[in-house]
Interface confidence: low
């Protein structure tokens, strides 16, 4: 008969989570589950249970969690890998705009996310929007070109950066920046 | 690294009081075991982050209390009515899952231990 559907794994609020700051990890199956399995990977750490309450967000808990759950004696497949980053580690970098942040429909824009430190990576986020600009070509890079601006373009944007060597531990987030769509 | 620091412990006669303390470098959910000598360590008692929540072990209900005050980041354990029985070190754990668990395997972190000996 196959193994079981895998379920879906959610970090709420967020899975960006501010040291000390608390995170709920959930791990959501089909009706009925006898029993849920939540995994931190590359490590030991694990719960059989479908919750996890983060009260306090710490470095070490940064990183992939998974989660399965079993019904009689089969095991689902493994949900999809989620990301849980820490935020804060490091100071904020700074986020501008090039030319500037009030511009033309139909014009090119350049954002540029600047740190004191020597990150090799970048991560982009527009306020509304679930996941961070992370094409290649603009995750390992510290500008991130808008070309061919339209409204949608409009809204409050913040960088993080953070280093290759650790990518779940990032800096705060960047005072935020309005991007004016005219 | 979470450390944690108990105190407290010492000798007492059977039917008096200690209160343990546990110092943490962070909040968690915690938990308080013991291991009385030639024995496997065995759970005692555990609190939630907020505190709203607590589990004991058969063996100290109505006798032991967990308390904590966040505010210290430190974790109580109200022990009355010792018997030679409690004879042990107490452990401090501390769990990343806020489930007050009786399961070693539950807890990341723990203490040093400190010595409760209760004589008859």
């Known amino acids: 008969s196959g193994p079981l559907p895998k379920p879906s794994l959610q970090a709420l609020p967020s899975s960006l989570v501010p040291l000390e700051k608390p995170v709920t990890l959930r791990c959501q199956g089909p009706p009925g589950v006898d029993l849920y399995r939540l995994e931190k990977l590359s490590s030991s750490r694990y719960q059989d249970q479908a919750v996890l309450f983060i009260p306090a967000m710490k470095r070490s808990l940064a990183g992939r969690y998974r989660c399965s759950y079993q019904n009689g004696s089969l095991w689902s497949l493994p949900s999809d890998q989620l990301e849980l980053v820490a935020t804060g580690v490091f100071a904020k970098p700074s986020l501008s705009a090039q030319p500037g942040p009030a511009v033309s429909s139909g014009g090119d824009v350049t954002l540029q996310c600047q740190t004191r430190y020597g990150f090799d990576q970048f991560a982009l986020y527009k306020e509304g929007d679930p996941a961070p600009y992370k094409n290649p070509e603009r995750w390992y890079r510290a500008s991130f070109p808008i070309i061919t601006v339209t409204a949608a373009h409009s809204g409050t944007y913040r960088c993080y950066s953070f280093s290759s060597r650790d990518p779940y531990l990032w800096s705060a987030p960047s005072d935020p920046l309005e991007l004016v769509v005219t | 690294q979470v450390q944690l620091q108990e105190s407290g412990g010492g000798l007492v006669q059977a039917g008096d009081s200690l209160r343990l303390s546990c110092a943490a470098s962070?909040?968690?959910?915690m938990g308080w075991f013991r291991q009385a000598p030639g024995k496997e360590r065995e759970f005692v008692a555990a609190i939630s982050w907020s505190g709203g929540r607590t589990n004991y072990a058969d063996s100290v209900k109505g006798r032991f209390t967990i308390s904590r005050d966040n505010a210290k980041n430190t974790v109580y354990l109200q022990m009355n009515s010792l018997k030679p029985e409690d004879t042990a070190v107490y452990y401090c754990?501390?769990?990343?899952?806020?489930?007050?668990?009786?399961?070693?395997?539950?807890?990341?972190?723990w203490g040093q231990g400190t010595q409760v000996t209760v004589s008859s």
């Open positions: 754990s501390a769990a990343i899952y806020d489930n007050v668990s009786s399961r070693i395997g539950s807890y990341t972190y």
């Open positions: 962070g909040t968690y959910s």
